[in-house]
Structure formats: structure tokens, C-alpha cells
């Protein structure tokens, strides 16, 4: 038995039959000894006397709230709730299983940016006696805060003969940092309490994979002279992180007809404008996604094909314009080759992704993950690596992706990724271990030392232990090549002398 | 399942036109937009155009645009491609093909040799 | 117009060892890209469009990565079927072009 709140208490049931329960003493909250009785919920019928009562627990008719008095007069109360555990698993009653992106996921979460700020929802087909209760934490052994609104009833549905209701809550890091590189996951607990059932669900994620924008806003079209042609042109969402030289994002632009099954013409570019087809009684649609980092793709922004008659052209906000200052990456050298490294940097994007298709869709944080990759660097919130750090002084930035890229391509070139199963040499791994030299290079070339961070000795014996750590290895890397592409973009557009 | 049947080959003087057909079968004849693409003996891919049936609607490569005219009679599911003042570097296997996607090409015809001889 | 340039023009590669293709477009194209495979007297198949995705009924050995202006096609393990020439193609704006091709051939 444990403390849910004050006056309100779970017991822990293994759930068979004729299981025998749980002993549980409840004590009455007075200074008073004698003349004490006990009920429970409404009834009158007393339970027993005296300041403690001792109940075996057993099924939910023991559950409820027990009421101590003294002469009429109601002294405190305890709320017992239960907590079923069957075959060794806690149940899951209340809510619903959204089965995406798996099975037995309880509770979905988006960010429409890298604020810190994320949305959780879940589904129960159950409309009264129900509560919520939403904790959330950056990290589990020393956790961050994070700070949870009250879950409210966000939608309602109905499904076939049932009604669904959707509930959703907001929470917000308390120190967000959205440059950085995340470490630790953020993680959410949701009590749901039905009648006198208690359950709890947990969500782990990082917010860069929760990440889903809003929508391109503002589609504008204008058509080409003596061409089928059409111009569309759209802005960023106004609620993506900013500056978007910086936090980039890639489109997908498509024309199709009312069905899905009709023909399209469909171009992926990284512009806030693009030229394509529009036939009658189409429409053009464009979508949204984090350019460096495979999160989801926004819902889709529409505007219909006819009646393309906008005065204006593409007005892109991709950018935030202006030739920085010319600075100094390395102590007496000069910038790094901006654009290079923002062309090798979006390469090592793709490559760390197509380096194993299923990394993007394993969920490899288990037990003891968070040791398990603390030991590779992270680019911190103190690194310098955000629009201002780069601003004030590029180099500490440069410098530990510097050491980063030199961290991974050794990684990569270890015996984890040489061992059993084979890679070969031009394999995505392979060629992923030569552009991160290639880049290191590009940013520490001959005569410049920067100190490396020591490779840790991580070597397993067992080929399914070496996947199992290329893939978390790898799902590290496209976390780390995502900021690195960033720095490098904006550094491209902003610091390029 | 989607199948394109081209005409057959053809033989032309310079300064003469070719007129080659396409045949289509399996699926709806408006759904799919139809491409037309050329390669000379040896030599590499080349777009040439596309049009919608559904509607007529053309798009030729600037290299080909006064020269080509692409045109489909819904009637019998066909797409003709007609070359006019022909030249000995117009000599190539001609493809047309079919997509719902307007920019890649899914489904092929078997080609059509066209040779320009004097 | 985008330029392709397919690297190598010709490839040789023993059967079961693998194959990559490299093309490279004059300007970013995103991931507009797509691969085809051609045998002598045989029309162009699609393998890869947009960059990576993959086609049903094409064997899982053949792969497709890149974006941006570098572009690569991995022939995991080449099969005797295999052998033929491949052709990229660009499809960010018309008119839409094909890379020169690579003839992958018995070593």
C-alpha cells in the first residue's frame, strides 16, 4: 500500500482467484484513543472500533472510503483504491490501446517545436467517475522539472455503438533549451483513477521525436506565363522554433484531386516556393518536417488550383537574412568553410538515417539506457552552439563537434560496427564513417589539435549485444548530426563572411 | 494490370514526321499521366513531354517544343507523339509511359524504333 | 536545366559483391530523385523513387540514400540479373533529366 495523496491510498493486488489479498491497517488522523468506529463509503454498518482498523483487501467491494468516528462526528477519512496486477502485469482498464506507432500505446505526445512546450493525449471509452492526474520529469535518477497542466476532456467521438472520449494535458520544461542536443528523455506519468480502480501510464520520449509542425501557413499561388505551371509559395508555421535559418524545415508539396486515388504531381524541396502542375478541380497541398531530423510530417496546408490568382510570388521566411560577422572558428585561424560543412553536414543527415532503415522506428530506450549512452558527447546547452553562442563566439561550438565527429567516426570504426554481423566498406555505415571524417577534417585542418574526448570501451561479446548498441549508436548519431547540420546551416546563411 | 503497347518501327527521310502510338490497357485511361521519352542507339535516357489525358494538358521539353505534339483519344485509350522535320539525331527507340505520378515513370511501352535515313 | 552526372560509367563487380552507384545533380534537388534499371533491348524499370523509397516487387538488395545534390544506389549483393545499366533521374523541376548511366557489368 502506498500514498496516491493525502487521505487517498493504492493497494497493490495480485489478481487471481482466490488470491488472499492484502493486510491493511488504517490508522484514524486524532489525538483521540477511545470511543473510535469505523464504516465505510455510505453504509452505517460499523466495521469495527478503535483508533486502527485492519481490513484483508481482496476485491473491490473492500476498496473505498473508510470513515473514522467519535460520537457522531466525523474524525478522517482513507480512501482505499486498487491496483490490479495480473500474470505480473498491471492493468490497463481505463485507457484506450491507440495501437500507433505501437501496440500498447496509452498515451500519444506532440511538440510543434523545440520550446519545451509538448501536448499528451489518450482515449477512454469510460465518461464518468474518472480522473486524471499528469506528472512529468526530464530524466528518471535526476530528474528535471517539467511542469503539467490539468488534463481536460479535449474531444469527444463516436465509434461505432461507443462514444470515445480523448483527454489532453500541456506540459512545459521549466529549462528548455531547444539548441541542444537531448540526452535524457523526457518522461510522463498519468494516474487514472475509475471509481475505485487505480492505474498508472508512462510515456519516455525525447522531444525531437515527438516534434510534428504545424502546418506551412499562408499558401499563395501564381501562375507562370505560357506555362501549365503554377508558382506556390507558403511561410513558415508561425509556431516553429525560430531563427529558421537555424531550425530549417523541408517541404512537400503536392497537387492531387479530391481522392487519393486520382493522379498527382508531388515535389519535395527545401524552399518556401516551388513550381508545379495544378489541374482543374485539384488542389495544392504542402506539408512540413524538421529538415535534419525524421520527426513527423505536419498535417497538410490546402489551397484549391482554381482561382490561382494571387499577385504575389514565394515570400520565404527560410532564412533570417544579414552577413554575420566574420568570425573566427579556431584561436588564430579562420571561419570554417560554412556552406562545405552545411553540405557534408545535411549528407551525414540522410546517411545516419538510410544507415539502418529500422533504427528510426525501434524503440531502443529500455532499462538502464540512460548509462548506456551517457557516455557519448552531447552537444549541451552550454556549448554554444545556439543562434547567439554562434553569434558571440563560434569556436567552443565548432569545437565540440569537432570532438563529436571525431568520437563517432571512431565509434564506427571499432569493433562494435568491424565485428559480426558484417558491414562492408560502402555500406550507409561505411560510407557515414567517411563523412564524418571527411567533416572533422573540413573543421580541424592540419596543424590545429583540439582535445578528443576518450572513445569508451564499449565491446560486447554477443553479436545481437553489438546490434542492438550499433543501433542505439546510431540513433545517438542522428540526434548529434541534426544540431551539427543546424550550426552549420545557420552558420552558412548568418556567418559566412 | 497496366500495359502499353507501342506501334511498330519506323523508317523516315530527314525533313519528313513521325507519328508513333501507344496503346493503353488495364487500367482507367484519364488516371495516368503519359510521358513520352527517347534514347538514341547507345545513348542515354531523354524526356521529351507529357500530357493529361484527362484534359489535353501538355508539357514538352524546351529542346523538343515547336518540333513535338502530343495528343490522346480517350475513345480507344491511345497516346500518339508526332516529330516533325525529322533529322538523322532524332534516330532513337521512343518510349511512352505511364504514372499517377506526373515526375518519374512507372510503367513503360516496349518502344518504337524510329531511324532517319536519307 | 539540372545536369546529372553519373560516377562510374562503367562498373565492374563480381556476382554477390555489392554495388554503388553515385549521381550527382548541378543543383539541390532535395530528394527529387529516382533510379532505373535497363537491360539490352529492354524499356527502363523504376527501382527507387524519391531518393529512397522503395517499390514493390524490386528485391530489398537494391537501396537508395541521398539528398541535396549526391545521390547513391547500393546493389546490396549483386545477382546475375543485376547486371544492366542504371539511370538516375531528376524530377525538381522540368524539364526532368536523366544522369548519363552506369553500366554495371561481370568483373
Known amino acids: 500500500i502506498w500514498e496516491l495523496k493525502k487521505d487517498v491510498y493504492v493497494v497493490e493486488l495480485d489478481w487471481y482467484p482466490d488470491a488472499p489479498g492484502e493486510m491493511v491497517v488504517l490508522t484514524c488522523d486524532t489525538p483521540e484513543e477511545d470511543g473510535i468506529t469505523w464504516t465505510l463509503d455510505q453504509s452505517s454498518e460499523v466495521l469495527g472500533s478503535g483508533k486502527t482498523l485492519t481490513i484483508q483487501v481482496k476485491e473491490f467491494g473492500d476498496a473505498g472510503q473508510y470513515t473514522c468516528h467519535k460520537g457522531g462526528e466525523v474524525l478522517s477519512h482513507s480512501l482505499l483504491l486498487l491496483h490490479k496486477k495480473e500474470d505480473g502485469i498491471w492493468s490497463t482498464d481505463i485507457l484506450k490501446d491507440q495501437k500507433e506507432p505501437k501496440n500498447k500505446t496509452f498515451l500519444r505526445c506532440e511538440a510543434k517545436n523545440y520550446s519545451g512546450r509538448f501536448t499528451c493525449w489518450w482515449l477512454t471509452t469510460i465518461s464518468t467517475d474518472l480522473t486524471f492526474s499528469v506528472k512529468s520529469s526530464r530524466g528518471s535518477s535526476d530528474p528535471q522539472g517539467v511542469t503539467c497542466g490539468a488534463a481536460t476532456l479535449s474531444a469527444e467521438r463516436v465509434r461505432g455503438d461507443n462514444k470515445e472520449y480523448e483527454y489532453s494535458v500541456e506540459c512545459q520544461e521549466d529549462s528548455a533549451c531547444p539548441a541542444a542536443e537531448e540526452s535524457l528523455p523526457i518522461e510522463v506519468m498519468v494516474d487514472a483513477v475509475h471509481k475505485l480502480k487505480y492505474e498508472n501510464y508512462t510515456s519516455s520520449f525525447f522531444i525531437r521525436d515527438i516534434i510534428k509542425p504545424d502546418p506551412p501557413k499562408n499558401l499563395q499561388l501564381k501562375p507562370l506565363k505560357n506555362s501549365r505551371q503554377v508558382e506556390v509559395s507558403w511561410e513558415y508555421p508561425d509556431t516553429w522554433s525560430t531563427p529558421h535559418s537555424y531550425f530549417s524545415l523541408t517541404f512537400c508539396v503536392q497537387v492531387q484531386g479530391k481522392s487519393k486515388r486520382e493522379k498527382k504531381d508531388r515535389v519535395f524541396t527545401a524552399k518556401t516556393s516551388a513550381t508545379v502542375i495544378c489541374r482543374k478541380n485539384a488542389s495544392i497541398s504542402v506539408r512540413a518536417q524538421d529538415r535534419y531530423y525524421s520527426s513527423s510530417w505536419s498535417e497538410w496546408a490546402s489551397v484549391p488550383c482554381s482561382g490561382s490568382g494571387s499577385s504575389r510570388g514565394g515570400s520565404g521566411s527560410g532564412g533570417s537574412g544579414g552577413g554575420g560577422s566574420k568570425l573566427r572558428a579556431v584561436p588564430g585561424g579562420s571561419s570554417p568553410a560554412w556552406t562545405q560543412c552545411q553540405q557534408l553536414s545535411q549528407k551525414l543527415c540522410t546517411l545516419a538515417w538510410s544507415a539502418h532503415p529500422l533504427v528510426g522506428h525501434m524503440d531502443l530506450r529500455e532499462e538502464g539506457d540512460e548509462e548506456t549512452t551517457n557516455d557519448v558527447p552531447h552537444i549541451q546547452c552550454g556549448d554554444g552552439c545556439d543562434p547567439q553562442g554562434l553569434r558571440d563566439n563560434s569556436q567552443f561550438c565548432l569545437q565540440r563537434i569537432h570532438q563529436g565527429l571525431i568520437f563517432y567516426e571512431k565509434l564506427l570504426g571499432s569493433d562494435i560496427f568491424t565485428g559480426e554481423p558484417s558491414l562492408l566498406p560502402d555500406s550507409p555505415v561505411g560510407q557515414l564513417h567517411a563523412s564524418l571524417l571527411g567533416l572533422s577534417q573540413l573543421l580541424q585542418p592540419e596543424g590545429h589539435h583540439w582535445e578528443t574526448q576518450q572513445i569508451p570501451s564499449l565491446s560486447p561479446s554477443q553479436p545481437w549485444q553489438r546490434l542492438l548498441l550499433r543501433f542505439k549508436i546510431l540513433r545517438s548519431l542522428q540526434a548529434f548530426v541534426a544540431v551539427a547540420a543546424r550550426v552549420f546551416a545557420h552558420g552558412a546563411a548568418t556567418l559566412s563572411p | 494490370q497496366v500495359q502499353l503497347v507501342q506501334s511498330g518501327a519506323e523508317v523516315k527521310k530527314p525533313g519528313a514526321s513521325v507519328k508513333v502510338s501507344c496503346k493503353a490497357s488495364?487500367?482507367?485511361?484519364?488516371?495516368?499521366?503519359l510521358h513520352w521519352v527517347r534514347q538514341a542507339p547507345g545513348q542515354g535516357l531523354e524526356w521529351m513531354g507529357w500530357?493529361?489525358?484527362?484534359?489535353?494538358?501538355?508539357e514538352y521539353a524546351p529542346k523538343f517544343q515547336g518540333r513535338v505534339t502530343m495528343t490522346t483519344d480517350t475513345s480507344t485509350s491511345t497516346a500518339y507523339m508526332e516529330l516533325r522535320s525529322l533529322r538523322s539525331d532524332d534516330t532513337a527507340v521512343y518510349y511512352c509511359?505511364?504514372?499517377?505520378?506526373?515526375?518519374?515513370?512507372?510503367?513503360w511501352g516496349q518502344g518504337t524504333m524510329v531511324t532517319v535515313s536519307s | 536545366e539540372i545536369v546529372m552526372t553519373q560516377s562510374p560509367a562503367t562498373l565492374s563487380v563480381s556476382p554477390g559483391e555489392r554495388a554503388t552507384l553515385s549521381c550527382r545533380a548541378s543543383q539541390s534537388i532535395s530528394i527529387n530523385l529516382h533510379w532505373y534499371q535497363q537491360k539490352p533491348g529492354q524499356a527502363p524499370r523504376l527501382l527507387i523513387y524519391?531518393?529512397?523509397q522503395s517499390i514493390s516487387g524490386i528485391p530489398a538488395r537494391f537501396s537508395g540514400s541521398g539528398s541535396g545534390t549526391e545521390f547513391t544506389l547500393t546493389i546490396s549483393s549483386l545477382q546475375s540479373e543485376d547486371f544492366a545499366v542504371y539511370y538516375c533521374q531528376q524530377s525538381n523541376s522540368f524539364p526532368l533529366t536523366f544522369g548519363g548511366g552506369t553500366k554495371v557489368e561481370i568483373k
Open positions: 488495364g487500367y482507367t485511361f484519364t488516371d495516368y499521366y
Open positions: 500530357i493529361d489525358p484527362e484534359n489535353g494538358d501538355t
Open positions: 509511359n505511364a504514372n499517377k505520378e506526373l515526375r518519374y515513370f512507372d510503367v
Open positions: 524519391f531518393a529512397s
